[in-house]
């Protein structure tokens, strides 16, 4: 278990022309509110896919009215950090959304009005109880200047919170086998109650007995790197388990590399293999630069030659974002015909056809069973040249591919608008309300009104639902 | 090919009622958004109408304006109509059928129309 | 809601450089969801700018989209005789219900 921070340093017009009017007039004063939304992983998830890993909602910042004539300036930002606990394992990489909000507070008809004003993502490695890292995004014309880190909440320590300390029982050292508990050195490791040998950087339990492998690592005792096929370099007793030699101690144990960077062994000591925005010899120094590479997908990175001057990512075809990275949605505009599936592979747009149609961009119908079946259980019924589907329930469309209609349950609240989509259906959330299905209100003083958290978690550990 | 072709308009008189019917071919209302009308007065501006979800929900929106004499309504996976009744002469347009997708994050993107259907509204 | 276009009709010569802008008298959705159409006579309108300033499929590069909230602008650059045709601006909005409205257009005239 655990807290990942995020700290707001500045949120305002970026570099270069085409500087941003003001969100607030003095017709229209407004103030700003964030949320955030993490995942597991370094996944490309959708704006709209739930925060697996917690999401939470800042307080509202100050009251801000622009200065008739004035450009935009950095806007006042809300008090204190955004906290989102984490209950299980910190899982070291992840992605992230930070979302910017403006609360309207002319005299609008029933209260106050909300309007995004900028999303910016990213994916991230960070290990837990490291330093606060610095980052720089930009949406369009906006930059938000952050940083973050993940802290474990005792008595869980170590990089993934996974290991547990206890107070010692001794005042002088730690029970046979039992390491002292870094920072915490009064403390120390408790007993292991996972499956003998598990590992304790790269495994964890919740039961005891048992040997659950972080991401990137497997094995019974989450030893064996994910990536490696064969076995690790031998430097130890052989495993009869795995056939496979288990390392001994080394120069990476405890993996000296800060801010997710991760460490391989030289002849004569270590070498951090660091995380965009991290370098240095364990990778402690942050300030995200072009020399860090912080552009995803092929972007060029231009500018940014201090980590106190921004970058900007000109992105390849097929990628936006501050940092490219995010997907262009160019499906959206349904260039498959005929109810074909449209998949961007990024250099070119493929359609898959439903049975009966063929091309490109499936404009050419067959027309006929032979040789064809509908899809999901669907039987298929010849009749003059052309051929129909009788479809399993739960299913529709010339051969059954369609499932059925998702917004038929009109799963979009508080009067948000759905839409089918490729990747299912997506809700369009009328303003004052937010999240997947528009189910939940933002209220004026900043809190979510979320459900109650079920067993195991704190009453005050909501958002993780958002 | 994706296409919208609206039928049903004519010459209708003053306090009369209309029917007018938007055919797709090429993909069905239910694998899109949604499906409106937008009319346009001869030699004037865009005028957004209404609109109905394209799934089996039969969600709508309407313009003020229009609420209370003209209905939106699905008939088939490829048929939409729009109803209008106390017709006057101001109701005289080109009447387009059009499809609203979602579009990052964006919405009312009319991405397709049909040709239109001339309503002509006189004694 | 009521959103402006000014200025019409606008007119300037081939290769040239044409600016229209729209004025929303309130923010539109999301302080983005605005559209630019394209019709010329006889014809329906035609999808070239979204979110403001997201280009529509196949529409040239020589169409930009800009602004938020209230203000939009429109520029066509490198004017062709093709371009010559009414533009109109389109904003989203919610009030107890989703609605949309048009601009009045604004007719570009190519010398």
């Known amino acids: 278990a655990g807290v990942f921070e995020l700290q707001i340093h500045s949120f305002g017009p970026g570099p270069g022309p085409g500087a941003p009017r003001s969100p607030c007039s003095a017709r229209l004063p407004c103030r700003l509110f964030f949320r955030v939304c993490l995942k597991p992983g370094l996944s490309e998830e959708a704006a709209e896919s739930p925060c697996a890993l917690g999401a939470a909602l800042s307080a509202r910042g100050p009251v801000y009215t622009e200065q008739p004539g004035a450009p935009a300036p950095d806007l006042p930002l809300p008090d204190g950090l955004l906290q989102v606990p984490f209950r299980d394992a910190w899982p070291g990489t992840f992605s992230f959304i930070i979302e910017t909000w403006r609360e309207e507070l002319g005299d609008q008809i029933g209260g106050p009005a909300w309007s995004l004003l900028a999303r910016v993502a990213g994916r991230r490695r960070l290990a837990a109880g490291g330093p606060w890292a610095r980052d720089i995004q930009r949406a369009g014309a906006w930059e938000l200047r952050f940083s973050y880190r993940a802290r474990c909440e005792p008595p869980a320590v170590g990089t993934a919170c996974t290991r547990l300390c206890r107070p010692r029982s001794a005042p002088s050292r730690c029970g046979p086998g039992l390491r002292p508990c870094a920072p915490l050195e009064d403390e120390c490791e408790a007993p292991l109650v996972c499956r003998a040998g598990c590992s304790p950087e790269h495994g964890f339990c919740e039961q005891p007995g048992e040997c659950r492998c972080l991401e990137g690592w497997t094995g019974p005792l989450c030893t064996v790197p994910v990536s490696t096929s064969s076995c690790l370099s031998p430097r130890g007793p052989s495993s009869a388990t795995t056939g496979c030699l288990v390392p001994g101690p080394g120069p990476c144990d405890g993996n000296p590399c800060a801010n997710g960077g991760s460490c391989s062994e030289t002849p004569r000591s270590f070498e951090c293999t660091c995380p965009r925005g991290f370098y240095g010899l364990r990778c402690e120094v942050s300030g995200v630069t072009c020399a860090d590479g912080p552009c995803f997908n092929g972007g060029l990175c231009v500018g940014g030659a201090d980590p106190d001057s921004a970058y900007i990512c000109h992105c390849p075809p097929g990628f936006q974002g501050s940092n490219c990275e995010k997907r262009v949605d160019r499906c959206s505009l349904q260039p498959c015909r005929n109810g074909g599936l449209c998949l961007d592979l990024g250099h070119a747009l493929r359609c898959r056809c439903r049975a009966g149609f063929a091309g490109p961009r499936c404009e050419h119908d067959l027309d006929d069973c032979a040789g064809r079946a509908c899809a999901n259980g669907g039987t298929c019924v010849e009749g003059g040249g052309a051929h129909r589907c009788s479809c399993a329930l739960g299913f529709g469309g010339r051969d059954c591919r369609e499932r059925a209609d998702p917004c038929a349950a009109r799963p979009c609240a508080h009067g948000g608008r759905c839409y089918a989509h490729f990747s299912g259906l997506v809700c369009a959330c009328a303003p004052g309300y937010m999240g997947a299905r528009c189910e939940f209100p933002v209220h004026p003083d900043g809190a979510s009104a979320l459900p109650a958290a079920p067993p195991g978690l704190r009453p005050g550990d909501p958002q993780r639902y958002l | 090919q994706e296409q919208l072709v609206e039928s049903g308009g004519g010459l209708v008189q003053p306090e009369g009622s209309l029917t007018l019917t938007c055919t797709a071919s090429?993909?069905?209302?239910?694998?899109?958004?949604?499906m409106c009308w937008v009319r346009q007065a001869p030699g004037k501006g865009l005028e957004w109408i209404a609109c109905i979800s394209g799934g089996s929900s039969g969600d709508t929106d309407y313009a003020n304006w229009a609420k209370g004499r003209f209905s939106i309504s699905k008939t088939s996976s490829t048929t939409v109509t729009l109803q209008m009744t106390s017709l006057t002469v101001a109701d005289t347009a080109t009447y387009f059928c059009a499809r609203d997708v979602y579009i990052d994050s964006t919405i009312f993107n009319f991405n397709l129309w049909g040709p239109g259907t001339l309503v002509t509204v006189s004694s | 809601q009521v959103l402006t276009q000014t200025p019409s009709p606008v007119s300037a010569a081939v290769g040239g450089t044409v600016t229209i802008s729209c004025q929303a008298s309130?923010?539109?959705?999301?302080?983005?969801?605005l559209a630019w159409y394209q019709q010329k006579p006889g014809q329906p309108p035609k999808l070239l700018i979204y979110?403001?300033?997201s280009l529509a499929s196949g529409v040239p590069s020589r169409f930009k989209g800009s602004g938020a909230g209230t203000q939009f602008t429109l520029t066509i650059s490198d004017l062709e005789c093709d371009d010559a045709a009414t533009y109109y601006c389109q904003g989203t909005y919610y009030s107890s219900g989703w609605y949309s409205t048009f601009g009045g257009g604004t007719e570009v005239v190519v010398k």
């Open positions: 090429g993909f069905s209302f239910s694998s899109s958004g949604y």
């Open positions: 309130q923010s539109v959705y999301n302080n983005n969801n």
């Open positions: 979110a403001a300033s």
